[in-house]
C-alpha cells in the first residue's frame, strides 16, 4: 500500500538567464528510495539520482543542469523555452513509484523575483 506523499516546490518563477532549484520531497512512508528521475515537459530526461550509482545528467543537459541540492536539481542559464512542467519520479521499495509536478515560469522581466514554496500537489 502506497502511503507516501510527494511535496514539491509547486509553481515557481525565475528570471531568464538565471537559475532555479527544482525540489521534491517524499514523506509519510518508510519505503526505501532507490532512484529519483527528473523529466521536462517535452518528455526530455534531465537527470537521474540513483542510491547506489549517484547522479547521471543526460548529455543534452550537461551544460545547464547541476545535481542537487539533495535529490533536487538546479537548472541554470534559463531560457523562455524552459517554461513548463517538470516531474520528479521517486522509485521506492516496496511501495513503487511516486510522481510530483512542478510548474516553472521563466520571466523576461529583470525585476521578476524568484518564488518558491513547498506544497502538496
Amino acid at each position: 500500500m502506497m502511503t507516501g506523499t510527494i511535496e514539491t516546490t509547486g509553481n515557481i518563477s525565475a528570471k531568464k538567464g538565471g537559475s532555479v532549484i527544482l525540489q521534491c520531497h517524499l514523506s509519510s512512508t518508510m519505503a526505501q528510495v532507490t532512484q529519483v528521475n527528473w523529466e521536462q515537459h517535452d518528455h526530455s530526461l534531465l537527470a537521474i539520482r540513483n542510491a547506489e550509482l549517484g547522479w547521471h545528467i543526460y548529455p543534452a543537459f550537461k551544460d545547464r543542469v547541476a545535481p542537487g541540492p539533495g535529490l533536487g536539481l538546479t537548472l541554470q542559464s534559463l531560457t523562455m523555452n524552459d517554461t513548463g512542467e517538470y516531474f520528479c519520479t521517486y522509485h521506492t521499495y516496496p511501495d513503487g513509484t511516486y510522481r510530483g509536478r512542478i510548474f516553472l515560469e521563466v520571466l523576461e522581466s529583470s525585476v521578476a523575483e524568484h518564488s518558491a514554496r513547498f506544497q502538496i500537489p
Partner: antibody
Framework: QVQLVQSGAEVKKPGASVKVSCKAS????????ISWVRQAPGQGLEWMGW????????NYAQKLQGRVTMTTDTSTSTAYMELRSLRSDDTAVYYC?????????????WGQGTLVTVSS | AIQLTQSPSSLSASVGDRVTITCRAS??????LNWYQQKPGKAPKLLIY???SLQSGVPSRFSGSGSGTDFTLTISSLQPEDFATYYC??????????FGQGTRLEIK
Amino acid sequence: QVQLVQSGAEVKKPGASVKVSCKASGYTFTSYGISWVRQAPGQGLEWMGWISAYNGNTNYAQKLQGRVTMTTDTSTSTAYMELRSLRSDDTAVYYCARAGWEQQLGFDYWGQGTLVTVSS
Amino acid sequence: AIQLTQSPSSLSASVGDRVTITCRASQSISSYLNWYQQKPGKAPKLLIYAASSLQSGVPSRFSGSGSGTDFTLTISSLQPEDFATYYCQQSYSTLAITFGQGTRLEIK
C-alpha cells in the same frame, strides 16, 4: 574491464528445473542489478526479470511468476536464474545483463549466453 | 504490458546508405527507449539509451530521436559491420520491460 561469464549449455527434460549462473567482474557488483533476457531460436528478445545485487529486490515478468527465481551471491559476484517446470517452449539462449539505474538506461554489458534445450 | 512495434521488419541497404528504423509504443513512454544491435550468435549490444543518448564507445553514425510514442534509430552512413538485427526496448515500465520484434538489416 567489465565481464559477465555464464555457465555452459544445458539439456533438460520437460518438468525439470535449470539454474544458470552469471559471474561478474570488473565493476562493483553490488552497485548494479542483473537482468535476465532470453531468446528462443530464431525469435526476438524477451525480458525475464531483474534482481538488485545491492538489496536482493526482484521484479519478474508476469508470465514467469511462480516458475522463476533470481538470486545473487555477493561474496562471489555471481547472479543465478532458476527456471522450474520446464516446457519445450522454454528452449532458448538465456542472457544475463548488467542493469543499473533501475534498468532505465539500458543493459550495457551482457553475458555470452547459455543455451538451454528442453527436450524429451 | 507496453507493446513496441518496429518498422520495417526487415530492410536491404548498401554500404554508405542512410538508414532509419522506427519504433512505436502502445502508450507514452517519455524518453525511456533504448536501442540494441545484435549479430548472429552474439549477445545484444547497447547503442542508444534514453531515446537519444549515445552509449560510450558506439560510433557517432548512430543516432536516436523521439519521445512519447514515436522513436527513430538512424545510421547516417552504413558500414559493413552494421548489418545486423536491431531491437528497441522500453524501460518506462521497469516491472514489465518489453522489446520490439526486431528489424533485420541486410546487405542489398
